[in-house]
């Protein structure tokens, strides 16, 4: 922590300017007025501070404000939004999109992920849901922000909002994301033809329960292996050969690249062999012909 | 990372003139500004002049008129100009460069070069 000293009378400061740059830690720390640097907070990211004076002003600020900073403050924080820390973050209710624009701008490139993804959080619990323009927020200037968001935060898009969501913006998301995604967007999609809805659900199938992956296979999609690959295991293992081969139509070959890799290995293992054989990939791993497939989980749900 | 390498110090007569430079290398991308520093026997390290990316300066109070900073962009290279020099400007000067973004943002520091104003 920065040692108190009073302040020298020619060193008293009576607004933020650049002379402060000359000013030592201890300078800083006794000469400058916590309310004068939230009241000129704008002006602070334009003066050329050393991280280490940066360091000072945060501890003004947050002695100033020890439950959080106000969002006049927050909106005007610039680089030293790089200082904050996801506890810091957790103190602070945003509801303005322009602060939430401005502080991604600052962290672009940073490794800032839990502070990014704790501001995001601050932002949807003070807007009260996660709504179309605060989604046209995230996906223009911060692709990929949106699955830094948990579940239960997820579970406020309203399906209307769905269609501003682009692939991009869920190559991070998780299962548990797509779990409470997927719903939503096949509600957003439902009146969409057949090949016009498989393009707009692909993204979000990591979601799908196994009866609207079967449903998908009637309907000659040609699912490409990099979406197979992302389906739920769960949803993947109860599907037939047949059926595999009619979701993946001409893309069905990638099924021996993806070989030894789940959910394609575990689902192997679920086939008869001479199933397996009829698709011509030389598959390995199916149950053998003349074996007794025993389901014991049924068993012992019913004991 | 970010490198920075001064050179130009060495002995001087009172009122004399030095140059000294400074040349950044590696991350070199986003600084935002350089500036240059002293230590001189038995003190803290000072800040003698500051320019920023958009070429505005700033001078102590101690050697405003007699130092003058300017950057070359192009070069990654800040210069400092000091005229009418004192004994009491003797020091190891120092340049800092700092980042504000990626991919390594905070402040950057030379290994120093020894200037001595004595008769």
């Known amino acids: 922590d920065v040692e108190r000293t009073t302040c020298p009378p020619e060193k008293e400061v009576h607004e933020i300017d650049e002379s402060l740059i000359f000013y030592k830690k201890r300078e800083l720390e006794a000469c400058v007025d916590a309310a004068l640097l939230a009241a000129q907070m704008d002006r602070v990211d334009a003066i050329p501070f050393t991280y280490e004076q940066l360091d000072v002003l945060k501890h003004k600020l947050d002695e100033l404000y020890p439950q959080g900073y106000p969002e006049s403050v927050i909106r005007h924080l610039g680089h030293l939004f790089l200082k904050m820390s996801p506890e810091d973050i957790r103190k602070w209710n945003v509801t303005s999109l322009e602060t939430l624009k401005a502080l991604l701008k600052v962290s672009k490139g940073h490794e800032m992920s839990a502070q990014v993804a704790t501001l995001i959080d601050r932002v949807v619990v003070g807007r009260g849901q996660l709504d179309k323009d605060t989604v046209d927020t995230l996906t223009a200037f911060c692709p990929g922000c949106l699955c830094s968001l948990s579940p239960e935060r997820l579970s406020s898009v309203p399906p209307s909002v769905i269609g501003a969501v682009r692939p991009q913006d869920l190559d991070t998301c998780g299962p548990r994301q797509l779990d409470v995604l997927y719903p939503k967007a096949r509600l957003a999609f439902q009146n969409m033809s057949g090949s016009e809805y498989f393009v707009k659900i692909r993204p979000f199938l990591g979601g799908a329960p196994t009866e609207d992956v079967k449903a998908l296979s009637q309907q000659n999609v040609s699912m490409d292996l990099a979406t197979f690959m992302k389906l739920r295991r769960e949803a993947v293992l109860p599907l037939t050969v047949a059926e595999v081969q009619k979701l993946l139509g001409p893309h069905v070959e990638g099924l021996k690249v993806e070989e030894q890799h789940s959910p394609v290995r575990d689902w192997i293992l679920k086939q008869r062999q001479d199933d397996l054989d009829t698709l011509g990939l030389g598959l390995q791993g199916g149950i053998p012909n003349g074996y007794l497939i025993l389901d014991l989980s049924v068993r012992e749900a019913l004991s | 990372q970010l490198q920075l390498v001064e050179s130009g110090g060495g002995l001087v007569q009172p009122g004399g003139s030095l140059r000294l430079s400074c040349a950044a290398s590696?991350?070199?991308?986003?600084?935002?500004?350089m500036g240059w520093y002293r230590q001189g026997p038995g003190n803290e390290r000072e800040l003698v002049a500051v320019?920023?990316?958009?070429?505005?300066?700033s001078y102590a109070d101690s050697v405003k008129g007699r130092f003058a900073i300017s950057m070359d962009n192009d070069k990654h290279t800040v210069y400092l100009q000091m005229d009418s020099l004192k004994p009491e400007d003797t020091a190891v000067y120092y340049c800092?460069?700092?980042?504000?973004?990626?991919?390594?943002?905070?402040?950057?520091w030379g290994q120093g070069t020894q200037v001595t104003v004595s008769s």
């Open positions: 800092n460069a700092h980042r504000r973004t990626w991919p390594h943002p905070g402040d950057y």
């Open positions: 590696g991350s070199v991308n986003s600084i935002t500004a």
């Open positions: 320019i920023t990316d958009r070429g505005r300066a």
